[in-house]
């Protein structure tokens, strides 16, 4: 492989590590859009025991601009020293490096969810993977936000055990014939910035007179 000395430093790439559906996904963007690599290779080592850089098998000669590191990066304490190489054919266009600490740099994407509206309640079905490794729980709690007519209510369901498998939460005591919107997100124990899901909305069906009167009480 030829190495054309690039005018590029570590600043030429921006990286982002996200927990997406409880998978650790590293994604990257190039700041200079005139450079178009045909493929990338991702390598890393651990700072506490620096060894030769290890190529991530499923991210060697990849055309994607992201890499699933769930099975590689386990520790929330370690510094993962990461090198991304960009190629055009056999020529190395650039090499970027960045250090990641999952405890600090991980952002938490909201889980997938569905809502079903009934007369005076909404079923929120949150989809978690069937198995989630302990290290990937990150002291996270699930938050479900209910919005109606400018009023926002936060629900923090207690999930027994790990966040795994599908989870259903009922938002009750709602008013029939009213529009409700729901957003879900994962909140970290130290209150770092959250990524809220897009709103999903439903107009509850009108209830019978007696039921409407009950709900209005």
């Amino acid at each position: 492989i030829s190495y054309d000395s690039p005018d590029y430093t570590d600043e030429s790439c921006t990286f982002k590590i996200s927990l997406r559906n409880f998978r650790s996904i590293l994604s990257w963007e190039l700041k200079n859009h005139s450079i178009v690599p045909t493929h990338y290779t991702l390598l890393y080592t651990i700072m506490s025991k620096p060894e030769d850089l290890k190529v991530v098998k499923n991210c060697a000669n990849t055309t994607r601009s992201f890499c699933d590191l769930t099975d590689e990066w386990r520790s929330t304490h370690e510094a993962y020293v990461t090198v991304l190489e960009g190629f055009s054919g056999n020529t190395t266009l650039f090499s970027c490096s960045h250090n990641f600490w999952l405890a600090i740099d991980m952002s938490f994407e909201p889980p997938e969810f569905e809502i079903v509206g009934f007369t005076n309640h909404i079923n929120v079905m949150v989809k978690f993977p069937s198995i989630v490794e302990e290290e990937l729980q990150f002291d996270l709690s699930l938050v479900i936000e209910e919005q109606s007519e400018g009023i926002v209510k936060k629900h923090k369901p207690e999930i027994k055990g790990n966040m795994s498998g599908n989870f259903t939460y009922i938002i009750d005591k709602l008013i029939p014939n009213t529009n409700y919107c729901v957003s879900v997100y994962l909140e970290h124990s130290d209150e770092q910035a959250v990524i809220k899901s897009p709103l999903k909305c439903t107009l509850l069906p009108p209830g019978q007179e007696s039921e409407s009167a009950e709900s209005a009480k």
């Epitope: 506490s48 520790s75 304490h77 600490w101 770092q192």
Partner: antibody
Amino acid sequence: QVQLQQSGGELVRPGTSVKVSCKASGYAFTNYLIEWVKQRPGQGLDWIGMINPGSGGTKCNKKFKGKVTLTADKSSSTAYMHLSSLTSDDSAVYFCARSGWVSAMDYWGQGTSVTVSS
Amino acid sequence: DIVMTQTPLTLSVTIGQPASISCKSSQSLLDSDGKTYLNWLLQRPGQSPKRLIYLVSKLDSGVPDRFTGSGSGTDFTLKISRVEAEDLGVYYCWQGTHFPQTFGGGTKLELK
């Protein structure tokens, strides 16, 4: 050799704010975390938070939420801790420390004394 | 938060004699990555802290081998085989396994 040089002591009024700096030298600044620790006079140590200078990502102790903002300037290899709405409880010596992994704190700055008094 | 309890509060020693400091945590410090993030530091009077031991038993470079760290789970010990004058000061254990990191209250090593 690795050095963390902190800014000089500060005497400030209650209700104001202060910015403590920690200039790193002798190593690649963006390859390590900077952690911050508080020590009140004659007391033990209290962990405030940490920053990854490479990404700007931070993680803070809830106890200091709303009180402390951590930043870093890669060009000058300097980390900063901004303390706001100061009260007498904030009078302390503040240390920065370098970490290769979370909680390592292998090198410490000399400390910056902040005194809040009217 | 994890509570780190150090004993004794003060340790009065004679130069050349051994010393032992205990540190107990309110929860196991064994992390899911298999490591135990328990460290020891020394703060000499009027100075900034200096790390002596990390990951329970690993000595920092330049730290004399008269210092040893041991323990697991919730119980940890720092031992000095023969105390020297430069060892005087306050010793702190701290844990980084659980967020937030927490320090022990300190043990003052002084001359008898």
